[in-house]
């Protein structure tokens, strides 16, 4: 699954919430960022995440489409120079400071499983998705396509505005 371009094809600034409308928030603690899943008070401002969309070639041996086997990969950055990373060993989702080009652990395959929700599959560990576990984000193994609609891996994007990249 190689990224076909160095630049994102499009970018959005959005807030991220769970299928059950809990907000994904990011807090700086002891010089590192923690990720929380929580109910926000009525007027509390939602944290925003920059989603950068990249085109990726699907591995041709799995695709009957020849040149057409494209997927969308996303990176998620809640603050400058920090990106969500998949830690496949610990089954955790972490925020790390990175420089471009970003490591593969920062890329997630985008799935629209339902009309109003998305899922993020780890590029480095196919079949493993960002999900919610004990009020935190974690990596969750999904063993069959039927389980892709399981609510704990579904997220809603509330777009706040378009982000003009150059």
């Amino acid at each position: 699954m190689s990224i076909t371009g160095i630049s994102p094809i499009t970018e959005y600034l959005a807030s991220l919430s769970t299928y059950n409308d809990q907000s994904i928030t990011f807090a700086l603690e002891d010089e590192s960022y923690e990720i929380y899943v929580e109910d926000l008070k009525k007027d509390e401002k939602k944290d925003k995440v920059l989603l950068s969309y990249y085109e990726s070639q699907h591995p041709s041996n799995e695709s009957g489409d020849g040149v057409d086997g494209k997927m969308l990969m996303v990176t998620l950055s809640p603050t400058k120079d920090f990106w969500l990373h998949a830690n496949n060993k610990e089954h955790s989702v972490e925020l790390h400071k990175s420089e471009k080009p970003l490591p593969d652990q920062a890329f997630f395959v985008l799935h629209n499983m339902h009309s109003n929700s998305v899922s993020f599959e780890s590029k480095t560990d196919p079949g493993v998705f960002i999900g919610v576990k004990d009020n935190h984000l974690a990596l969750i193994k999904v063993d069959s396509s039927e389980n892709l609609s399981t609510e704990n891996i579904l997220f809603k994007l509330s777009e706040t505005h378009h982000h003009h990249h150059h």
Epitope: T10, G64, D65, M71, M113, S115, V118, S145, H161, H162
Partner: antibody, heavy 122, light 107 residues
């Protein structure tokens, strides 16, 4: 190569229903969203709705919510659209389409069927 | 619903000419625009997506540009086969909407 083969032209009476088909080949049918688009004679294009064959999830243009029903048959890689309570306003060419990306819609129409002409007349 | 307005409605040009058509969105859509060509009696075909990305197999004489509310499709050195209707479409968000089209005729 990717191919979307639609059912043939139909003449239907006002008030009746009709179901058209779109048989997909050359790709993994369940992994791509399928959309339907209407083009009235000499007019522009209108998006009706989309369906994800893997889960059956769908998403509609409000204007067509009570007009169109989208279904799929995974065993034959075929998408269907049923139109109900037909009037002369529904006379049009209807296209099934598919996007460029696995798993994700983005509502971009990279592949098109040849279209099904529906004529509503008594 | 975001309205897409195309201009001009039609144009008549000679083979080899350079032509630019416009598409205006009623509100900011970022770069979420696609362009299609529909030749007489045929289904539409995707030319450009995300405002400026040429789709696979589309000749490089087609160029898309713009951001926000104003977009252009330019055809450098128009060919006889480019006689068609051209539609812009807002992508990504539901419901996607199409412009009314620009008809390109070859003199």
């Amino acid at each position: 190569q990717v191919n979307l083969l639609q059912s043939g032209a139909t003449l239907v009476k006002p008030g009746a229903s009709m179901k058209m088909s779109c048989k997909a080949s050359g790709y993994s049918f369940t992994d791509y969203w399928v959309s339907w688009v209407k083009q009235s004679h000499g007019k522009s294009l209108e998006w009706i709705g989309e369906i994800y064959p893997n889960s059956g999830a769908n998403n509609f243009n409000k204007e067509f919510k009570d007009k169109a029903t989208l279904t799929v048959d995974k065993s034959t890689s075929t998408a269907y659209m049923e139109l109900t309570r037909l009037t002369s306003e529904d006379s049009a060419v209807y296209y099934c389409t598919r996007g460029p990306y696995y798993y994700s819609s983005q509502i971009i129409f990279a592949y098109w069927g040849q279209g099904t002409l529906v004529t509503v007349s008594s | 619903i975001i309205v897409m307005t195309q201009s001009p409605k039609s144009m008549s040009i000679s083979v080899g000419d350079r032509v630019t058509m416009n598409c205006k969105a009623s509100q900011n859509v970022g770069n979420n625009i696609a362009w299609y060509r529909q030749k007489p009696g045929q289904s539409p075909e995707l030319l450009i997506y995300y405002a400026s990305n040429r789709y696979t197999g589309v000749p490089d004489r087609f160029t898309g540009g713009g951001y926000g509310t104003d977009f252009t499709l330019t055809i450098n050195s128009v060919q006889a086969e480019d006689a068609a209707f051209y539609y812009c479409q807002r992508i990504y968000n539901s419901p996607p909407t199409f412009g009314g089209g620009t008809k390109v005729e070859i003199k």
